[in-house]
Interface confidence: low
Amino acid sequence: KAMHVAQPAVVLASSRGIASFVCEYASPGKATEVRVTVLRQADSQVTEVCAATYMMGNELTFLDDSICTGTSSGNQVNLTIQGLRAMDTGLYICKVELMYPPPYYLGIGNGTQIYVIDPEPCPDSD
């Protein structure tokens, strides 16, 4: 079953390569287990950036080596992606799945265009 997911259209990463955005979903029911996946679309290729499953009211748990962190509050997920470089500029799509209890719901956002600008190297000081 389809579910609406909202996310900002554009986000500019910080000079340290960190970008944060909110992914909000319109939950049709009272889900207790939610899975959030961030996918990057660039040049018609779609790749999974990170994913986390969480129980409502608990913290999101990404893999240890994940470049993502996040927190949840109600039907909002605050996502942060770290270690971004200019080459990582692209459309980052938030995918939300209500895993339990049934029925299963799937929602896909329109994507957040994240722009990453590599900082100019600091000139050597004498």
Epitope: T37, Q45, V46, I93, E97, M99, Y104, I108
Partner: nanobody, 135 residues
Framework: EVQLVESGGGLVQPGGSLRLSCAAS????????IGWFRQAPGKEREGVSC????????YYADSVKGRFTISRDNAKNTVYLQMNSLKPEDTAVYYC????????????????????????????WGQGTQVTVSS
């Protein structure tokens, strides 16, 4: 424009084999799921098999497990359904269908089989090819 064209159907005797092809255009198979479905006269369309483009996972309906094999050729952008040991009850119009990878759920095993073999999960459909198993 997404297009799916099935071929390879025909009349075959019980115990015989057929290979169906589903030629896709307008997209690449890499991030799509392609499913095979069939519909016999007076019956609902039922899922037969599916291959998920992102990782190549395959799913089969219990009624065809061990007899049917789904595969894909990315270079030809084509998905195949090899059907062996055909039975009269396999007689139906066979359709291939596609759904974009973003719409694929994070379900594996039995849950995945259930989702991928549901006709309502798919967005694009071919016109179908008739398979008749009769002596």
């Amino acid at each position: 424009e997404v297009q799916l064209v099935e071929s390879g159907g025909g009349l075959v005797q019980p115990g015989g084999s057929l290979r169906l092809s589903c030629a896709a255009s307008g997209f690449t198979l890499d991030y799509y799921a392609i499913g095979w479905f069939r519909q016999a006269p007076g019956k609902e369309r039922e899922g037969v098999s599916c291959i998920v483009g992102s990782d190549g996972s395959t799913y089969y309906a219990d009624s065809v497990k061990g007899r049917f094999t789904i595969s894909r050729d990315n270079a030809k952008n084509t998905v195949y359904l090899q059907m062996n040991s055909l039975k009269p009850e396999d007689t139906a119009v066979y359709y291939c269908a596609a759904v974009h990878g973003l719409k694929l759920p994070t379900l594996r095993g039995l849950g995945g089989s259930y989702y991928y073999l549901q006709a309502r999960s798919y967005d694009y459909w071919g016109q179908g090819t008739q398979v008749t198993v009769s002596s």
